[in-house]
Amino acid sequence: GSGIFQLRLQEFVNQRGMLANGQSCEPGCRTFFRICLKHFQATFSEGPCTFGNVSTPVLGTNSFVVRDKNSGSGRNPLQLPFNFTWPGTFSLNIQAWHTPGDDLRPETSPGNSLISQIIIQGSLAVGKIWRTDEQNDTLTRLSYSYRVICSDNYYGESCSRLCKKRDDHFGHYECQPDGSLSCLPGWTGKYCDQPICLSGCHEQNGYCSKPDECICRPGWQGRLCNECIPHNGCRHGTCSIPWQCACDEGWGGLFCDQDLNYCTHHSPCKNGSTCSNSGPKGYTCTCLPGYTGEHCELGLSKCASNPCRNGGSCKDQENSYHCLCPPGYYGQHCEHSTLTCADSPCFNGGSCRERNQGSSYACECPPNFTGSNCEKKVDRCTSNPCANGGQCQNRGPSRTCRCRPGFTGTHCELHISDCARSPCAHGGTCHDLENGPVCTCPAGFSGRRCEVRITHDACASGPCFNGATCYTGLSPNNFVCNCPYGFVGSRCEFPVGLPPSFPWVA
């Protein structure tokens, strides 16, 4: 504690100019005062002035009024500072002395003589109001007032509460009369060191370092930090929780980067071909006859479909083709024969059957041969039966497809799941994507294959309520609560049917 006992001397009357011993002062009583302040005593005794003492210079002769003076020698009121808790009681001894010596430092002069003394004992509360008193004896009268006030930055009824107004990192406050803190606008807390964030700033997702601010924690955005940020890799998606990637309409894939309506948006298929929103690139072109290529952009030779039968040779012309027929055949495609079974037209052991009363014939071919005259060895690969880039190989009476890595099946039509070899560690969930498997990791793990144990597991603190399951999702710093039936909220903290602001008590 810290305070000041103040004594204001107002008037001293010693009309006859007498000393306490009955002698008179020559030429008059040149008066100064000694003040001794000590702890309360029922009977005032000599001894140290435990609360302080002070002397004045000569203030006047015999009778005089003491004027207020704020500085220098002869200051009035007199100041008796203390640095302890004010006890509320005191003893005060005021002595009037005559000095024949120095006006300014009479205390040091020899031959000083006592004029009179008064003793006051009692209680005194801290306060600004002066207590006024007057003491008389046979020869003298003293008028005075006194009070106890607290030093700067000290407050309370015993000046024991320290409070210094501040506006810095450690607090933002002024001091009340009782010494309690009064926070400056925008600040709160015991020491007024907590800023009051922007009204509506989300309690969990936002924070502030100064008033009316709302700074979002990772994964959140917006004025009130109540809107999530999608995943870093997300292209055409949004989120309902941080780092999610929920695809906009028409987009698919883990990062919503696969155009589900590629055909409509980009029209990649040329020359009247049909576009389907499927396949490894997000679309497939089905070409009209006479065209080939990924986008049906390449025109085929008119002879590419082998239109000439019976061994006829094909010649390309500007917008069509021409068949040169071998001996015994005629027609646009060499489809008519001048031969009969008598000419033994069937090769490779084919059987000849007469038609149209012997004017024409038909050959029945043995296995592995074909053509009007059984002249062609069957090539089972001509129909391109192998899908997904598989290689077709003739094996005697049959053919096989040699599949590229990642495909299987008779026609290489089946995609081998990358997930079949269980690449995800620690119970991660595997998703097959075009560029390989992607693992969604359980709480506590991350990495491409869930191989990294997360030291700061967001789920470790058990943030989900009401029996919800916690997942770390796509980012190890954030968690997702999977709510049981009947509960909603980012932490499953609200029962269904109650507004999110309703303080639910289980």
């Epitope: 955005q221 870093n232 991350s446």
Partner: antibody, heavy 118, light 107 residues
């Protein structure tokens, strides 16, 4: 493919103004917060400003507050940085980036050079 | 503001070497740390986010580790295209701040 293309850089006198633009493609621009990051010649990277996707809330580094304004036009898939009262210390390559102040900057433009000199 | 300090500021290495760059934060930033690669005259490119997650299309020779205040970027077997400047960045506290960079040069 995500693309961010900045424009509008150039030489300007101290106290002058410039407006940088960033054209975005390859992603749904309106779904994502955006930022400007700068790099003084031969120096490191320094975040400048951010704008949210949801409500257009803006944040600035202290040294540019009151002088720079970040804005966006979702209909045009464009981000802007209006720079007023330019100082010599604002000289830098300014990059447009996808991200907020509390998320990584996942995609960056090629940058546009702003030189403030008399 | 949080200070990010990278070390070393530069280092020389050979193709095939294993290289480690460290980044220290002046206070706890949990796992909210990213690493970027920048080649001369080019824009930075995100390599790693959330301390240890590889960004899309980044080779698996890059990896990140750490938490709290100390973080590491490791390149397991240096390739010719990896010679560049690398920056770390924290996004846990406002404002976001970057390290001063580490220049990786060919020996």
């Amino acid at each position: 493919e995500v693309q961010l293309v900045e424009s509008g850089g150039g030489l300007v006198q101290p106290g002058g103004s410039l407006r940088l633009s960033c054209a975005a493609s390859g992603f749904t621009f309106s779904n994502f917060p955006m930022a400007w990051v700068r790099q003084a010649p031969g120096k490191g990277l320094e975040w400048v400003a951010t704008i949210s996707s949801s409500d257009g809330t803006t944040y600035y580094r202290d040294s540019v507050k009151g002088r720079f304004t970040i804005s966006r036009d979702n209909a045009k898939n464009s981000l802007y940085l209006q720079m007023n009262s330019l100082r010599a210390e604002d000289t830098a390559v300014y990059y447009c980036a996808r991200g907020y102040y509390n998320s990584p900057f996942a995609y960056w433009g090629q940058g546009t050079l702003v030189t403030v000199s008399s | 503001d949080i200070q990010m300090t990278q070390s070393p500021s530069s280092l020389s290495a050979s193709v095939g070497d294993r290289v480690t760059i460290t980044c220290r934060a002046s206070e706890d930033i949990y796992s909210n740390l990213a690493w970027y690669q920048q080649k001369p005259g080019k824009a930075p490119k995100l390599l790693i986010y959330d301390t240890n997650n590889l960004a899309d299309g980044v080779p698996s020779r890059f990896s990140g580790s750490g938490s709290g205040t100390d973080f590491t970027l490791t390149i397991s077997s240096l390739q010719p295209e990896d010679f560049a400047t690398y920056y770390c960045q924290q996004y846990n506290n406002y404002p976001p701040t970057f390290g001063q960079g580490t220049k990786l040069e060919i020996k």
